[in-house]
């Protein structure tokens, strides 16, 4: 009777429960990856930078995999990704090769099956720095909506690198997963 | 039989659907505030807002709380957090104290339990805004994905207060709960 | 008995299944649009930009219309919108009309019940593109959290949209459903 | 809190030469770099230069590049500015400041400015 049902809801109630707290509220995959300052490369051409945290700090992943400065995704969806990436230059650190800069970011998908990338986002300035202050700064933001497979990687490339700030509030990128893929 | 089924499926499904929009639908917590105008401090240090409205135009509120010039959180989680901030000067305003600024803001968070303020994104520019333009405008965006821990405190820090852009569209932060911590 | 239990709880469990990935996984509505480079208006005024891809490469949409130059919520929510804006002058390309811009994205939000359109969120620069650098570029990214109602019409308004970037991953906007309205 | 007081302004013909001090004063270690910036008439407020307490570095503006000096003084906490080659264009409030910050153009010091009036 009653008490068959109550025993039968609560068993099919603590499944779901089960089931839409894993499928749901804590399996959704996201990162948030600060730039590794030990590591950032020379030189004012652009290259995708391969040192990050995923651990320490601000930087955190679940559901996600960073291996060889990659953000790998492990589970098909679609997922807002972001980039935050800061320049700056100190009259202190020697003059600038030139006064007239381009800085840019690029966020970019690669595919292992098809061996292909493709920049899904990107932003930055040209810049005029000149020499009469003694501190220059820049910063950009990029976001988007994209579908991702299992098994692509997301990754960042800059142009002049050795401008960057190394702080984990300045330059950083992530994704988040938002929606199943119908 | 089959009519004792269908009502406790009914039952049992009923009961999910309120819990299901309960929890998931319509408790996850967001903010969007926007800035108040009436209350911008002047000078050209670095200064935190404490005036936003959280409940005209497009400011809301749910499930947060505003309070002393700070967006409180209520509900453990990890959430997407964004700032946009504007700024604009106009020579009928009169001369700017210098053509070299910086314009800035900081996105931090307090925590109550353990006395400290970090901070969590930042971004800006240098500019020269030089008097040979009658008018001149700049904006930051920041967004990121971040663990918000009941109690904890999220505030916006800006240089050059005097020079922001006071309509809603334009200097604004928020937030909203994308995930649960597991 | 037990079998019963099992049968019911399976045919539960199945109906839910559905129900979950009906209402949430995979009914959420989103939209990310690019800009379709064949139809850029020319000049320096602000115009409303009304030509957008929503099916190629990048570009996509669910549960959303693409109609007009305008994208049209079929869902009431609060959704997450944002916008990616690049602007480019490069010196091949002829003189600018002037050298001081204002390089700026206006999203814009129409109701036709009440015939009348409001900027939610506003981004970008002045900027001295003098003629002494061959190149010149600068993005813009905004982003808010926003109630939309089921008929209402996001568009989005630039100047100069001569000096557009047509790639997509250059100029796009987009939005995507957090949650229900309570 | 540091204190910041200037002298040495005053009324001086064309090509002549000024020397500015700033006597500074309180906790000067927690100064990164001490400006001098001037303000002429009807104008907004621009740097000169910058010497900075680790190394007693200088870096110049390109208006005064080659005529004027930043020196200081370590033992009476004194810096200076040697304007030569004085120009009417040089007519402003000289200010010093000091900060705290590497990576900031806000100066968190102010002296109350002496006055260079060069005369044709």
């Known amino acids: 009777g009653s008490q068959h049902i109550r025993a039968e809801k609560a068993m099919v109630d603590g499944s779901w429960l089960d089931l839409a707290k894993r499928s749901k509220l804590e399996a959704q995959p996201f990162a948030h990856l600060t730039i590794n300052a030990t590591d950032i490369p020379s030189g004012s051409h652009k290259v995708s930078l391969s040192s990050w945290y995923h651990d320490r700090g601000w930087a955190k992943i679940s559901n996600m995999t960073f291996s060889n400065g990659k953000l790998i995704v492990n589970q098909d969806g679609f997922y807002y990704l972001y980039a935050n990436i800061c320049f700056r230059h100190h009259e202190t650190s020697g003059d600038l090769a030139t006064e007239y800069l381009q800085l840019m970011v690029y966020v970019t998908k690669t595919s292992i099956k098809i061996p292909s990338s493709h920049t899904l986002m990107k932003g930055g300035s040209t810049k005029y720095w000149s020499g009469n202050s003694e501190f220059h700064f820049y910063s950009i933001n990029v976001g988007g909506f994209f579908k991702l497979r299992s098994g692509e990687e997301i990754s960042i490339e800059v142009s002049n690198p050795s401008l960057l700030d190394p702080d984990q509030d300045a330059t950083y990128f992530g994704a988040f997963k938002v929606r199943d893929i119908d | 039989g089959s009519q004792h089924i269908r009502a406790e499926k009914a039952m049992v499904d009923g009961s999910w659907l309120d819990l299901a929009k309960r929890s998931k639908l319509e408790a996850q917590p967001f903010a969007h505030l926007t800035i108040n105008a009436t209350d911008i401090p002047s000078g050209s240090h670095k200064v935190s807002l404490s005036s936003w409205y959280h409940d005209r135009g497009w400011a809301k509120i749910s499930n947060m709380t505003f309070s002393n010039g700070k967006l409180i959180v209520n509900q453990d989680g990890f959430y997407y957090l964004y700032a946009n901030i504007c700024f604009r000067h106009h020579e009928t305003s009169g001369d700017l104290a210098t053509e070299y600024l910086q314009l800035m803001v900081y996105v931090t968070k307090t925590s109550i339990k353990i006395p400290s303020s970090h901070t969590l994104m930042k971004g800006g520019s240098t500019k020269y805004w030089s008097g040979n333009s009658e008018f001149h405008f700049y904006s930051i965006n920041v967004g990121g994905f971040f663990k918000l821990r009941s109690g904890e405190e999220i505030s916006i820090e800006v240089s050059n207060p005097s020079l922001l852009d006071p309509d809603q569209d334009a200097t604004y932060f928020g937030a909203f709960k994308v995930r649960d911590i597991d | 008995g037990s079998q019963h239990i099992r049968a019911e709880k399976a045919m539960v469990d199945g109906s839910w299944l559905d129900l979950a990935k009906r209402s949430k996984l995979e009914a959420q509505p989103f939209a990310h649009l690019t800009i379709n480079a064949t139809d850029i208006p020319s000049g320096s005024h602000k115009v409303s930009l009304s030509s957008w891809y929503h099916d190629r490469g990048w570009a996509k949409i669910s549960n959303m219309t693409f109609s007009n130059g305008k994208l049209i919520v079929n869902q009431d929510g609060f959704y997450y919108l944002y916008a990616n804006i690049c602007f480019r002058h490069h010196e091949t390309s002829g003189d600018l009309a002037t050298e001081y811009l204002q390089l700026m994205v206006y999203v814009t939000k129409t109701s036709i019940k009440i015939p009348s359109s409001h900027t939610l969120m506003k981004g970008g620069s002045t900027k001295y593109w003098s003629g002494n650098s061959e190149f010149h570029f600068y993005s813009i990214n905004v982003g808010g959290f926003f109630k939309l109602r089921s008929g209402e019409e996001i568009s989005i308004e630039v100047s100069n949209p001569s000096l557009l970037d047509p790639d997509q991953d250059a100029t796009y906007f987009g939005a995507f459903k957090v949650r229900d309205i309570d | 809190e540091v204190q910041l007081v200037e002298s040495g302004g005053k009324l001086v013909q064309a090509g002549g030469s000024l020397r500015l001090s700033c006597a500074v004063s309180?906790?000067?270690?927690?100064?990164?770099?001490m400006a001098w910036f001037r303000q002429g008439p009807g104008k907004g407020r621009e740097s000169v230069g910058r010497i900075y307490w680790s190394d007693d570095n200088t870096y110049y503006a390109d208006s005064v590049k080659g005529r004027f000096t930043i020196s200081r003084d370590n033992a009476t906490n004194t810096v200076y500015l040697q304007m030569n080659s004085l120009k009417p264009e040089d007519t402003a409030v000289y200010y010093c400041a000091g900060k705290t910050t590497k990576w900031s153009l806000e100066y968190d010091y102010w002296g109350q400015g002496t006055q260079v009036t060069v005369s044709s």
């Open positions: 309180g906790r000067t270690s927690s100064i990164y770099n």
